[in-house]
Amino acid sequence: APTSSSTKKTQLQLEHLLLDLQMILNGINNYKNPKLTRMLTFKFYMPKKATELKHLQCLEEELGPLEEVLNLAQSKNFHLRPRDLISNIRVIVLELKGSETTFMCEYADETATIVEFLNRWITFCQSIISTLT
């Protein structure tokens, strides 16, 4: 059974991930972002189901495309270079979902824009955090 300390650690990691995703979304939605139109043409794949930490595999598999989209944006929209930002997110996601179990992500048929994609994973983080508190 998870201990209170491991639950707290998970909660903190989810909060960190949530803040990173919100920061990216805010940077993209910045009215000064000249690349927004092009960024919205990138297709992102959404999970059929995202209710458990293991489903973060679906987010992990989209972090490569996410980094490429962020490379389009002006770096001043973010505190970190896209490569460093995605690297940080990868570390958190890996710790949350674990590297031992190999979960195969199932994707929904419909693709999403980067904004829809980020909102979906922000909602996921908020939902899991609420169950831990």
Epitope: R38, T41, F42, K43, Y45, Q57, E60, E61, G64, P65, E68, V69, N71, L72, L94, S99, M104, C105, Y107
Partner: antibody
Framework: QVQLVQSGAEVKKPGATVKISCKVS????????MHWVRQAPGQGLEWIGR????????KYAENFKGRVTITADTSTDTAYMELSSLRSEDTAVYYC????????????????WGQGTLVTVSS | DIVLTQSPATLSLSPGERATLSCQAS??????LSWYQQKPGQAPRLLIY???SLASGIPARFSGSRSGTDFTLTISSLEPEDFAVYYC?????????FGQGTKLEIK
């Protein structure tokens, strides 16, 4: 169906520069990141670098930095790879290949390839 | 840089047999791995992407699997046209790197 057609074989002297082209047909080049990969005779595959033709941003493998320049001409849907200060070890088949994030997940990998261009460096 | 180690270097089998090709990554790369087939004088052809997904037009006898940083390409029953060189490629981070290849030859 997207097709990539590369320029013909080249023979160059050590120290010279070679420039290979890769023409995209069946779609616009700006939908793709254009990558270059090489293969020395009897050897494996080696990633050189890539360009985003929409904004000309490039990424190069460390081994090639300073010697390689990848460019693209959106008016002709053509990508170019220029390699300078050639040496005998650069003798290889050079391939262009694509990645895109605008379509299916499969096309995020090297799904389309040119036929290859043999570059021979010999004195 | 991420190193991909393929084994065996050469695999000698007969048509109808099962082929198992291995690719081991030097660090965690999630499912950012693909497999390519290359025949003499031809460009590589995408077989498997995202570790386990079959590329379009590729026969169902090809399959990919992953266990941690170990990846496997399996050909369930070899056809004469399957004898070629196979490469794995990681897309987890640049520089993208290939394995050194496994040559599948007729026994």
């Amino acid at each position: 169906q997207v097709q990539l057609v590369q320029s013909g074989a080249e023979v160059k002297k050590p120290g010279a520069t070679v420039k290979i082209s890769c023409k995209v047909s069946g779609d616009t080049i700006t939908a793709y990141y254009m990558h270059w990969v090489r293969q020395a005779p009897g050897q494996g595959l080696e990633w050189i670098g890539r360009i985003d033709p929409d904004d000309d941003s490039t990424k190069y493998a460390e081994n090639f930095k300073g010697r390689v320049t990848i460019t693209a001409d959106t008016s002709t849907d053509t990508a170019y790879m220029e390699l300078s200060s050639l040496r005998s070890e650069d003798t290889a088949v050079y391939y262009c290949t694509t990645i895109t994030f605008l379509y299916s997940r499969e096309l995020r990998w090297f799904a389309y390839w040119g036929q290859g261009t043999l570059v021979t460096v010999s004195s | 840089d991420i190193v991909l180690t393929q084994s065996p270097a050469t695999l000698s089998l007969s048509p109808g047999e099962r082929a198992t090709l291995s690719c081991q990554a030097s660090q965690y790369i999630s499912n950012y791995l693909s497999w390519y087939q290359q025949k003499p004088g031809q460009a590589p052809r995408l077989l498997i992407y995202s570790a386990t997904s079959l590329a379009s037009g590729i026969p169902a006898r090809f399959s990919g699997s992953r266990s941690g940083t170990d990846f496997t390409l399996t050909i369930s029953s070899l056809e004469p046209e399957d004898f070629a060189v196979y490469y794995c490629l990681q897309h987890y981070s640049t520089p993208y790197t290939f394995g050194q290849g496994t040559k599948l030859e007729i026994k």
